[in-house]
């Protein structure tokens, strides 16, 4: 056949979907891949075309869109499930072509099973809260499209296992669930199920995300800089090891970039002759606060390097600090044997 | 997760010297600072002095000052509180306690304890 | 050095109703925007755990029953609902500065 501008398979697109339920997938090609969408596609005379390649299958199938009730149709960009099937799993293809035109791209479908509790290997996306900042909410996400605006849904919604009803501090609105302070025993995993009638039959989506209860704006401060301080000396001998740790406390800060690095004499330590070797280690506090540390070694140290200005700096989004650690070699205590000869006037 | 494990009880004689050991996993050792807390039968808790492994560095409570020697082992992540001139006012629980970080420079709380090395003296 | 003076020094409370128990320091342990007055629970024959840092921040995994506040020379850990398993002994801790660290002398907590 002739030649099609070929996306490949489009793995950062992995669709997951439950058994059972409607889904509508959207052609990824007007959405990632091309200047234009389905309107002029079509009035330019381009058809969209849909295949597929079933789970542990080489071979591409068209897609059967006479299966009783419409149980798979397509309507204009979207191909529909009403509903799924677990063996309707595979990649799926769509094709923009005409004469002198054709463009494709594939995408993996896996359809997914749940149990009573909504537990599933479905991925699930994270929705954070600041914590104790008032009136926040979360919306049942991706059920745009499934049903027209005359229709009247039920929407339930689940903690876990648990329906949601006479909770201290979450309350369901419709398509909203609002947490009036949020705390940490907030977090854990909300599930909407949403109902409504189409042609005489009754569908369920059921949407489930991650809320995480993070550290509030209104708490942010600047990195603080735990060490180096001014209550702690690395007293060295020339020939031992200096090990000095920069430990920084970072407030969470939605999509900020948390940097922690040394500067030896005002200099990066790439950009110095001694063997420094920095390692870096970081920790999460429950609320996402940042602790990183690294740790700043010079194996042999020599009196050169203990004369040197050790500075570790720290910068996020609230500002940027820096602080020198206190170095100094050690002072040898006198040896009682050269004092003693010394005394007896020994030269 | 962090864990600090202390050696087994002592009994010693007044006059003598005991050290107990504070063995620290699951963090950074180098990087907080180690604290030795001790609580006399019935009684309450009583801050004995803290080091700051990376450096060295020692503070004290003045009533241990020059009878308590805090030191370190680095390549085993141990903690070490060496007590001299034993008395029987010296009979106690003996805890190692490591200080947090948090957002705040300075008043840290102590967030991991170990579970304690009884020491008695007694004649 | 800083004096930290809790009352009452035992306290017996009714299940499922709530414990104060105050803790004065002698000046204060406050700066801008932090207190370092820290909240343990000590059970029998165990070592103390942390419930509360910096005067009103709950510890992780410590349930929400537990509060603190105040600042300056005066502050408060409150339990309600009090449960069986809160019957411990109560310390009141403040780290102002180092090496300064000193602990008040305790609460015994019991269920009437």
């Known amino acids: 056949s002739e030649r099609c501008d070929d996306w490949g398979l489009d793995t950062m697109r992995q669709i997951q979907v439950f058994e059972d339920e409607p889904a509508r997938i959207k052609c990824p090609l007007f959405e990632h891949f091309l200047k234009f969408n389905y309107s002029t596609a079509h009035s330019a005379g381009l058809t969209l075309i849909w295949y597929w390649t079933r789970q542990d299958r080489d071979l591409e199938e068209p897609i059967n869109f006479r299966l009783p009730e419409n149980r798979i149709s397509k309507e204009k960009d979207v191909l529909w499930f009403r509903p799924t099937l677990l063996n309707d799993t595979g990649n799926y293809t769509c094709m923009l072509r005409n004469t002198t035109y054709c463009s494709k791209v594939a995408f993996p479908l896996e359809v997914v099973q749940k149990d009573s509790c909504f537990n599933s290997p479905m991925k699930l996306p994270v929705h954070k809260l600041y914590i104790e900042y008032g009136i926040q909410r979360i919306t049942c996400p991706n059920v745009d499209g499934y049903f027209p605006s005359s229709v009247k849904p039920t929407i339930t919604w689940y903690m876990g296992c648990y329906k949601i009803q006479n909770f201290n501090n979450v309350i369901p609105e419709g398509m909203n669930l609002s947490f009036l302070i949020a705390l940490i025993s907030n977090n854990g995993n909300y599930t909407c199920v949403v109902t409504y009638p189409e042609n005489g039959r009754t569908f369920h989506l059921t949407r489930t995300l991650t809320v995480k209860v993070v550290g509030s704006p209104k708490n942010a401060v600047p990195p603080v800089i735990h060490s180096p301080n001014d209550h702690v000396v690395y007293e060295k001998e020339p020939g031992e090891e200096l090990l000095i740790p920069c430990t920084v406390y970072f407030s969470f800060l939605m999509d900020s970039r948390n940097e922690v690095w040394w500067t030896i004499d005002g200099k990066k330590p790439d950009d110095i002759t001694i063997d420094v070797t920095i390692n870096e280690s970081i920790s999460h506090s429950r609320t996402e606060d940042e602790t990183r540390t690294q740790i700043l070694s010079i194996k042999k140290v020599t009196s050169e390097d203990l004369k040197r200005s050790y500075v570790c700096h720290a910068r996020s989004a609230k500002g940027e600090v820096a602080k020198a650690a206190k170095v100094k070699q050690k002072v040898p205590a006198p040896r009682y044997t050269v004092e003693l000869a010394c005394g007896f006037g020994a030269t | 997760q962090v864990q600090l494990v202390q050696s087994g009880a002592e009994v010693k004689k007044p006059g003598a010297s005991v050290k107990l050991s504070c063995k620290a996993s699951g963090y950074i050792f180098i990087t907080y600072w180690m604290n030795w807390v001790r609580q006399a039968p019935g009684q309450g808790l009583e801050w004995v002095g803290q080091?700051?492994?990376?450096?060295?560095?020692?503070y004290y409570a003045q009533k241990f000052q020059g009878r308590a020697t805090l030191t370190v082992d680095t390549s085993t992540s141990t903690a070490y509180m060496e007590l001299s001139s034993l008395r029987s006012e010296d009979t106690a629980v003996y805890y190692c306690?490591?200080?947090?970080?948090?957002?705040?420079?300075?008043?840290?709380?102590?967030?991991?304890w170990g579970q304690g090395t009884l020491l008695t003296v007694s004649s | 050095d800083i004096v930290l003076t809790q009352s009452p020094i035992s306290l017996a409370v009714f299940l499922g109703q709530r414990a104060t128990i105050s803790c004065r320091a002698s000046q204060s342990v406050s700066t801008s925007g932090y207190s370092s007055m820290h909240w343990y629970q000590q059970k029998a024959g165990q070592p103390p755990k942390l419930l509360i840092k910096?005067?009103?921040d709950l510890e992780s995994g410590v349930p929400v029953r537990f509060s603190g506040s105040g600042s300056g020379t005066d502050f408060i850990l409150n339990i309600h609902p009090v449960e069986v398993e809160d019957i411990a002994t109560y310390y009141c801790?403040?780290?102002?500065?180092?090496?300064?660290?000193?602990f008040g002398g305790g609460t015994k907590l019991e269920i009437k």
């Open positions: 910096y005067a009103s």
């Open positions: 306690a490591r200080t947090d970080f948090y957002r705040y420079d300075g008043g840290y709380a102590l967030d991991y």
């Open positions: 801790h403040h780290s102002w500065g180092i090496p300064m660290y000193t």
């Open positions: 080091i700051f492994p990376a450096s060295g560095t020692t």
